[in-house]
């Protein structure tokens, strides 16, 4: 499809002149930020951003790539170098330490400097690094964590936990030696390391004693509580604050978010990760957009401002499965949440960042016609005279041989949410990729997000913009609309 | 390898504080640009940038990813949407029209709006769009084109040509009907469409009559001239200017670039594309860095300034071959040329952009240890119990089956310049990829390069910064150091 209006040079010249006009008008917001929001698209490399843009555009009945995402409207962009201290290609634990604490760490460790060693409990003490969320709380702001994964997962844990092993979700996931040496599971750290006002996501089973039935799946033993210490961490958390409320479904979340007596809110909507958006039951589970809105309602009440972490955490999972349909529908939902947050906040007082922790070996190639489905086949056939998809992976479970040859694929197969795009190398799980990811920024001090930076720079921009440690002497005018 | 200094949080905190300090000090250069330089890494998507950074760092005996490329030092970054009017994933012709002329076109067409149709000569007339280089020449600036491909190749041709078929290098590549309808081959357009002061790259055979022996390969008939019209285009070009000089080897280039009587310089160093850097004979052929330096010497003499296009054109070719070694060594050489240009120009009066026309389905994954060779194997084995490389392709000639199975690979194989990384789908040629590419900017008006933009915006930024058509009423103070 060639859109007639795009055949005219005036279309492009006018559009560019408008973009130039906007660029010339762009003025840095030089005040401090009252509020900080970081949107983290887990595994959302640039190829995922572009493919999600096309999908979102096509969902809106456009051709695709011309239609801006919410994040595309952010005025400032930088590239972030994601390597961990010990690996060229990182994981979500080491990267969370970087963008949330401002210090790079080692693969699979969270909230610890690189002096800590994976799985060695005795290297924890003394190597803790403090998250920007923690510093925001100390400065009197309200703070929240929202994710589509378990709230104890690597990315959100970077905001509150310190652990040499990202897999220590509950004490049942830890070796006895680590427990004896005094290391704490992530769920325990969630409720005890710091005061978090809003906690929304999955991860019920790590909060309750082993065998405790799940409220949503009472007859499914695999969803029972897992804790060996017999504790009810939700109960312990509720006891800390008079205005604390725990919810486990969408209806309760909506009620709680509108209740002025609720000061602290924990919503855990699945035993483990939340369901993919395409599998979500909207009568039971909230969307990422709804969780973001609920969090913003509560956090916005604090006159001193807030810090909010929002993760589209299952973009990554879709890619690991070699299922681009899942990754991209998650990415579109993530962008919807960004859009909603933009409507509920002001760029005058809120610094909003959108970024990824790392990328994936996911590519969008061949030469598909404009307007063709993002999940479609490439024009023409491969050398083996079989069809192939425009979306492909470098490695992963999409690698299959059928009778010693690459399998053919039809349009109708390639569109299925279950379809695994093919890969060059067979792995149980498709891997992350090591290329730089984008950081999109809007609001006070967003102009500092520029050029090519270490991923750890992201945390420092947030800390500086809100005059948090170690930048309390930030020398910035107070946020718009404040009087202190 | 875990670098000891990186184990200390102070290392990262200090580094980030310095980066913040630099970001806060960053002041837009609000004057007009006297000079414009666009560095075009053909096929240099973000994954190529990161992998090249690691390779360049390792060449410098560092671990790799921490070591900035020359382009990493540019203060402003944007993302560029590369789709063509008719394709989600574009080619180098349609994209050249976008970033050099400011208007998006159709796949395989150059210097024409999307009203033109591929290969249909009669859709050319009236649909021509004018490059920024052409506008710079009209404004009295000197202009130059430097590439490692043929100078008649798609990317450089975007600066001077208008053609419905990028493959019409000489009249021998055109159907008789197109010649009869008055369409001109690209080599003819190179010498006749406009006055170009410096032309450096490959492409000798398209300039001379069929059967004319090549000076470097006189006994290789496949390198003979190709022109059916019997013309000697070099002779015709030399006749246009008293100070014109033609050179075909490195020694002559060095002499000519230092000769003040030379006002126009054409250097064609190979019959077709120039050799890959790893195959270059430095006694015969100049490097991209040397060609860039020679061009800058000549062009800098003009008190009104210059426009220079420099292409690392064979990054793309390495990827098409599924040979990452070639693509990445070309990218490192490209970065060396950027570095040299930075030493020879001032950011006070020169707007320098670095970008790509499109990406490739090239990924850098697995979880390789820090400091491991960029060409190395992934840690561990694949599901088929064979080794695999960190670098892989989505599609391309790297796909091979050996006895109905994926072949194994050793470290020594994977490090060979000839090695083709494996791919998910077998194609003669690995394809481009459709994700956004980075635009790096430094100099006057570089701050306008921000956010996510259409690729066509790039040309408009250059035109505006230098107050060229259609932005002659740019309302900018004159460039630094000028008196008019």
């Amino acid at each position: 499809i060639i859109p007639v209006e795009e055949e005219n040079p005036d279309f492009w010249n006018r559009q560019a002149a408008e973009a130039l006009g906007a660029a010339k008008k762009l003025q840095p917001i030089q005040t401090a930020a009252k509020n900080l929001i970081i949107f983290l698209g887990d595994g959302m490399g640039v190829s995922t951003v572009t493919a999600a843009r096309i999908l979102k555009g096509q969902k809106e009945e456009k051709l695709g790539p011309e239609t801006p995402l919410a994040m595309d409207h952010f005025p400032y962009v930088a590239l972030s170098k994601t390597y961990s201290v010990d690996k060229h290609v990182p994981d979500s634990a080491a990267t969370a330490t970087a963008y949330l604490c401002g210090v790079k760490g080692n693969f699979q460790t969270i909230g610890l400097s690189a002096a800590a060693r994976y799985n060695q409990c005795n290297t924890t003490r003394g190597n803790e690094v403090v998250s920007v969320m923690n510093r925001a709380k100390k400065a009197g702001k309200s703070v929240g964590v929202v994710t589509t994964t378990r709230v104890q997962h690597a990315s959100p844990a970077g905001a509150y936990a310190h652990t040499v092993n990202r897999n220590w979700y509950s004490d049942a996931n830890m070796p006895g030696s680590a427990r004896r040496e005094g290391c704490k599971d992530i769920a325990t750290q969630l409720i005890s390391n710091m005061d978090i006002d809003v906690i929304l996501g999955g991860g019920r089973k790590y909060m309750f004693r082993m065998g405790a039935p799940d409220p949503e799946y009472p007859h499914d033993y695999s969803q029972d509580g897992t804790r060996m210490d017999g504790k009810n961490l939700v109960q312990e958390w509720l006891a800390k604050h008079q205005g604390a409320r725990y919810v486990w479904n969408r209806t309760e979340l909506m009620q709680a978010s509108l209740d002025p007596s609720v000061t602290h809110l924990m919503g855990l909507f699945e035993p483990g990760d939340m369901k993919y958006e395409i599998h979500r039951d909207p009568t039971l589970d909230p969307s990422l957009m709804e969780m973001t809105e609920a969090a913003l309602r509560l956090l916005s009440r604090n006159p001193r401002g807030f810090f909010l972490f929002v993760e589209g955490g299952r973009i990554d999972h879709g890619h690991h499965e070699s299922r681009a349909y899942r990754a991209l529908t998650e990415a579109v939902m993530f962008d919807d949440a960004i859009e909603r947050a933009g409507q509920l906040t002001s760029e005058e007082d809120t610094l909003t960042l959108v970024t990824a922790d790392h990328s994936h070996v996911f590519s969008f190639g061949a030469y598909p016609l404009r307007g063709s489905s993002i999940f479609g086949l490439a024009p023409g056939k491969a050398q083996d005279r079989k069809a192939y998809t425009a979306l492909l992976y470098g490695n992963g479970p999409g690698y299959v041989l059928k009778d010693g040859a690459r399998p053919d694929v039809t349009e109708s197969e390639s569109g299925s949410p279950e379809y695994r795009q093919q890969a060059a190398v067979p792995l149980d799980e498709e891997t992350h990729a090591g290329e730089d990811v984008a950081v999109f920024a809007r609001g006070p001090q967003a102009h500092l997000v520029h050029g090519v930076q270490e991923q750890s720079f992201v945390a420092h921009v947030m800390a500086f913009a809100a005059c948090l440690e170690p930048y309390t002497a930030c020398d910035l005018a107070p946020p718009a609309g404040t009087t202190d | 390898i875990i670098p000891v200094e990186e184990e200390n949080p102070d290392f990262w905190n200090r580094q980030a504080a310095e980066a913040l300090g630099a970001a806060k000090k960053l002041q837009p250069i609000q004057t007009a640009a006297k000079n414009l330089i666009i560095f075009l890494g053909d096929g240099m998507g973000v994954s190529t940038v990161t992998a090249a950074r690691i390779l360049k760092g390792q060449k410098e005996e560092k671990l790799g990813p921490e070591t900035p490329l020359a382009m990493d030092h540019f203060p402003y970054v944007a993302l560029s949407k590369t789709y063509s009017v008719d394709k989600h994933v574009p080619d180098s012709a349609a994209t050249a029209t976008a970033y050099l002329c400011g208007v998006k076109g159709n796949f395989q067409t150059i210097g024409l709006s999307a009203a033109a149709r591929y290969n249909q000569c009669n859709t050319t007339r009236g649909n021509e769009v004018v490059s920024v280089m052409n506008r710079a020449k009209k404004a009295g600036k000197s202009v130059g084109v430097v590439t490692t491909t043929r100078v008649q190749h798609a990317s450089p041709a975007g600066a001077y040509a208008h053609t419905v078929n990028r493959n019409w290098y000489s009249d021998a590549n055109m159907p008789g009907s197109a010649r009869r309808e008055g369409c001109k081959d690209i080599a003819t357009q190179l010498i006749s469409n406009m006055d170009i002061d410096v032309i450096l790259g490959g492409g000798r055979k398209y300039m001379f009559r069929m059967g004319a022996p090549d000076p470097e390969y006189p006994h290789d008939y496949s390198q003979d001239g190709t022109r059916m019209d019997g013309k000697n285009l070099v002779q015709e070009w030399l006749a246009k200017h008293q100070g014109a000089r033609y050179v075909w080897n490195r020694t002559e280039l060095m002499q000519a670039s230092l000769d003040p009587s030379v006002t126009h310089l054409m250097g064609l160093f190979e019959p077709g594309d120039m050799k890959y850097e790893i195959h270059r004979d430095p006694t015969l052929d100049p490097s991209l860095m040397e060609m860039t330096e020679a061009a800058l010497r000549l062009l800098s003499r003009n008190p009104r300034g210059f426009f220079l296009f420099v292409e690392g054109g064979r990054i793309d070719h390495g990827h098409h071959e599924s040979r990452a070694y070639r693509a990445l060594t070309e990218a490192v050489m490209f970065d060396d040329a950027i570095e040299r240009a930075g030493q020879l120009t001032s950011e006070e009066d020169t707007l320098t952009l670095v970008t790509a026309d499109h990406s490739h389905v090239f990924s850098f994954g697995a979880y390789p240890l820090r400091g491991s060779s960029i060409f190395g194997l992934a840690p561990g084995k694949a599901q088929d119990r064979k080794a695999y490389t960190a670098l892989l392709y989505g599609n391309g000639p790297g796909y091979v089956l050996k006895d109905g199975a994926r072949p194994d690979v050793t470290e020594s194989e994977s490090g060979s310049p000839e090695y083709r990384q494996q791919a998910a789908v077998p194609l003669d040629e690995e394809t481009h990829a459709g994700e956004d590419v980075a635009v790096f900017a430094r100099g006057p008006q570089a701050h306008l390069v921000h956010g996510v933009q259409e690729q066509s915006f790039v040309a408009h930024v250059m035109a505006f910064a230098a107050c060229l058509e259609p932005y002659t009423a740019c309302d900018l103070a004159p460039p630094a150091g000028t008196t008019d």
Partner: nanobody, 121 residues
Framework: QVHLVESGGGLVQAGGSLRLSCAAS????????MGWFRQAPGKEREFVAA???????EYADSVKGRFTISRDNAKDTVYLQMNSLKPEDTAVYYC???????????????WGQGTQVTVSS
Amino acid sequence: QVHLVESGGGLVQAGGSLRLSCAASRRSFSEYAMGWFRQAPGKEREFVAAIGWSGVIEYADSVKGRFTISRDNAKDTVYLQMNSLKPEDTAVYYCAAGLGIRVVSQTPAYWGQGTQVTVSS
């Protein structure tokens, strides 16, 4: 998941009419573009018509002017009104759902089981 159930197929004389229905079991039916495909014996499945959530519509050239697609979001149902039927319209008709009209017309995510339409001459 989206479950699609077609109905309304049957035997009809050439020149006659049929109305196919497709009921979707899913909350965000209105987010999806809906389409109809058909597969004649021994042939590939081919696109017939699609309708986006915004009401934008596309038809295959072979059915333009004869078939009309419509949707009722309140009932989570999409319809295909088939007039001036020809023997070559004989096929199994499948309902499909996808994220946008371009996706549904090429690579639908969800398919119904199909309903047989036979046009006798």
